[in-house]
């Protein structure tokens, strides 16, 4: 007997989708071997329709896929737009179709129920609105119009033109009789319930001359859309509930084991603490649609999610909903990166951000998650070189190490920098990730002077002290601009106006500018790195003034403990523009900083990953 298991019989109707889950023993061989879905022909051969190696037959093109979940020993075959031709005998299996492990599945696709002749079918999701059209002849124009619901052999009056309304439909039904000449009346039912499902009868007049029309109302529990996302990645739920509820509070909730639905986020300001720092509810469009983005997906995020509208901001019977079943794939393409990065006040952090390596040319962004109201994420920096004004001189996004990872460096840290930040690109939205910056007790490892004033035409020497533990690291000085941090040439690159020399014995790396020019004014960073992986940085601002006294200026090491001017993120930042979540800017405040000097020449950034979950900043 085969150890592969699945549904022996699957039945559906034309136009629907099926999602067939097959189970296999999750041995290491089974986990990585080929998975397939094939159709058994008259000859007994089984023709592959879709496989885990990417093959999709022409018959299934654009409507089927196979997703493997190796960590729990399952794979799922999704087939959409079913037709009666899809009825037949299939196998789901592992390895080679003709031998190996498989399970027989019978798929039956039917036409749907038989209905009385001339029956109009209305298929509507629960919570939505239906308009039933009821034609009549001229002689019945002045007579009573009514809608009945057929329950077994009896007909129950639902509404009529004499103002009767069945209590089950109170406050959500109306009968409209148009002006003269239009031989049709309509019945509008709002906020449909599952119990409204069934056969209805429109009637105009009475006796043998009455007009009748059958209507079959199919109220559907919204079929959950199956969503498969990678661990650590991101999911977006797009929720379109219709204009009828455009001005009603919206929510996303998750169905729990008690079959109630716990609010994850709503437009009334409620948010589940489990999603702190990693969820945004996108502003509504005019049509009332909205979307919710969740990043940093965890295995425990799996489950059934519903979005809906109700004035209470939570699930209520008879209001429109949309449903998803979220599966989180543990065999993720998204690499592990620290979810928490620690730094000390005055110090720095270097954050590694993953992106889809197939999209190396995509624009990279970093934004600060703000939890107020529905959450927003104003952009702080992007790879094109725009940096928020408040972060001038202390924030840089660098393309290194590349190949699926970029780096963001933030220095001159204050307690107000603690919080959640998102890494994102203008490409694959599933690669959005979240990192939390924590400010802990401690002293920065790199020490530079607080302020430096250089004199035009003279020599400036700025010291940067580093501890012994960085002796094996590469030390560098760079000049910050809003496009990066241009590394300054080291002494062995030959004579230069600006060069770096390092005295290992005194654990000092000094920046020398000779002679000082107006263009030298600006922010300079001292930093350490290992290859393309950047460690800590310290920043110093150099102001340039006219010559007053002859001689060169040397900033003595004694001044190195002076604190740099702190730049604090103003909480009352003027909001320029709110953009929809589909825009990678995530409602960024687009304040553009003028270029402050040298263009970055490929200098980039990195992280010291002390563990897979936390990466150290200046707190080593």
């Amino acid at each position: 007997k085969s150890p592969v298991f699945g549904p022996q019989e699957v039945s559906s109707v034309e136009g629907n989708s099926v999602s067939i889950k097959c189970y296999y023993p999750p041995t290491s061989v089974n986990r990585h071997t080929r998975k397939y879905w094939c159709r058994k022909g008259a000859s007994g051969r089984c023709i592959t329709l879709v496989s885990s190696e990417g093959y999709v037959s022409s018959n299934y093109a654009g409507r089927a896929n196979l997703t493997n979940f190796p960590e729990n020993g399952t794979f799922v075959v999704n087939i959409a737009q079913l037709s009666r031709d899809d009825s037949g005998h299939y196998k789901c299996g592992l390895g080679i179709n003709s031998r190996g492990l498989s399970f027989d599945v019978s798929l039956e696709v039917s036409q749907g129920p038989e209905l009385p002749n001339g029956t109009e079918v209305y298929t509507v999701d629960v919570g939505r609105t239906v308009t039933i059209k009821c034609p009549f002849k001229t002689e019945n124009a002045p007579k009573t119009k009514a809608l009945y619901k057929k329950i077994g052999q009896t007909s129950v009056l639902v509404i009529d033109s004499r103002n009767y309304v069945n209590p089950n439909y109170k406050d959500r039904i109306r009968l409209r009789i148009p002006g003269t000449g239009q031989l049709i009346f309509t019945v509008v039912i709002d906020r449909l319930r599952l119990s409204d499902h069934g056969l209805y009868l429109c009637q105009a007049g009475d006796g043998s001359n009455r007009d009748e029309k059958n209507a079959d109302l199919q109220v559907l529990e919204p079929e959950p859309e199956l969503v498969y996302e990678d661990l650590r990645g991101s999911v977006t739920f797009h929720c379109a509930l219709g204009l009828e509820v455009a001005n009603v509070a919206k929510f996303l909730c998750r169905v729990n084991s008690r079959e109630t639905c716990d609010v994850v986020i709503n437009t009334l300001g409620k948010r589940d603490s489990a999603f702190e720092g990693r969820i945004l509810l996108n502003p509504q469009d005019k049509d009332g649609s909205f979307s919710v983005v969740i990043t940093g997906l965890r295995k425990e995020d799996e489950g059934r999610y519903l979005c809906g509208a109700h004035s209470d901001g939570q699930l209520q019977e008879g209001w429109p909903i949309q449903a998803w079943q979220l599966f989180v794939n543990e065999e993720s393409t998204i690499p592990r990166s620290p979810t928490v990065v620690k730094g000390v006040a005055g110090g720095s952090v270097a954050v590694l951000c993953p992106y889809n390596p197939k999209e190396s040319q995509s624009l990279k962004y970093w934004c600060l998650w703000e939890g107020a109201q529905n959450g927003r994420c104003p952009l702080l920096v992007e790879s094109q070189g725009l940096v928020q004004e408040q972060y001038e001189g202390r924030l840089s996004l660098l393309q290194e190490p590349g190949n699926g990872t970029f780096t963001v460096i933030l220095n001159q840290l204050t307690t107000q920098d603690a919080g959640f930040y998102w890494c994102l690109t203008n490409g694959d939205t599933r690669w959005r990730t979240t990192v939390e910056i924590k400010i802990i007790e401690g002293e920065p490892n790199l020490k530079v002077p607080g302020n430096v004033t250089a004199v035009l035409g003279e020599t400036l020497n700025i010291p940067c002290h580093f501890p012994c533990k960085f002796s094996s690291y590469e030390k560098y000085w760079c000049k910050w601009s809003n496009t990066g941090c241009q590394t300054l040439p080291s002494q062995d690159e030959g004579p230069s106006e600006a060069f770096v020399n390092c005295d290992e014995n005194s654990r000092l790396v000094s920046l020398t500018l000779n002679p000082v020019t107006r263009a030298d004014e600006g922010w300079y960073w001292c930093g350490v790195k290992q290859g393309h992986f950047y460690g800590e940085t310290a920043a110093v601002y150099v102001a340039v003034e006219e010559k007053k006294v002859a001689g060169s200026r040397y900033v003595s090491p004694a001044k190195a403990d002076a604190a740099p001017d702190e730049k604090v993120l103003d909480s009352g930042v003027r909001e320029i523009e709110n953009k929809a979540i589909q825009d990678p800017r995530l409602f960024a405040e687009e304040k553009v900083v003028a270029d402050t000097g040298d263009q970055a020449g490929g200098s980039r950034a990195s992280v010291d990953s002390s563990s897979s979950e936390e990466q150290g900043g200046s707190s080593k």
């Epitope: 019989e9 699957v10 039945s11 999602s19 169905v255 109630t260 639905c261």
Partner: nanobody, 126 residues
Amino acid sequence: QVQLVESGGGLVQAGDSLRLSCAASGRTRTTYGMGWFRQAPGKEREFVTTITWSGSTNYKYYADSVKGRFTISRDNAKNTVYLQMNSLKPDDTAVYYCAASTVLTDPRVPTEYDYWGQGTQVTVSS
């Protein structure tokens, strides 16, 4: 909460048929699957069959030991699941439990089910 009530059990001869019913009441709206397990004296509870659904699509799972003999079906309007048992054998003697789940990862695993009925005795004599 969801309440499940089984009925239809009894004493039959080998080769006979029996039909079990399981009526669900309460908050059945988000119920995703219902099935049958059985437990013979001194043995562990074992999977028999389950039906899961999504809209108008149904998925039926059967244990190898009952394939071709037992059939599961459901009446959506009545919130009821039926188990038609044909060609019964003495080995089928057990207490049959109805179970319901809101999210089902593996229909064969009893712990995946959130709600259980009290059980109905089926005895097949030779």
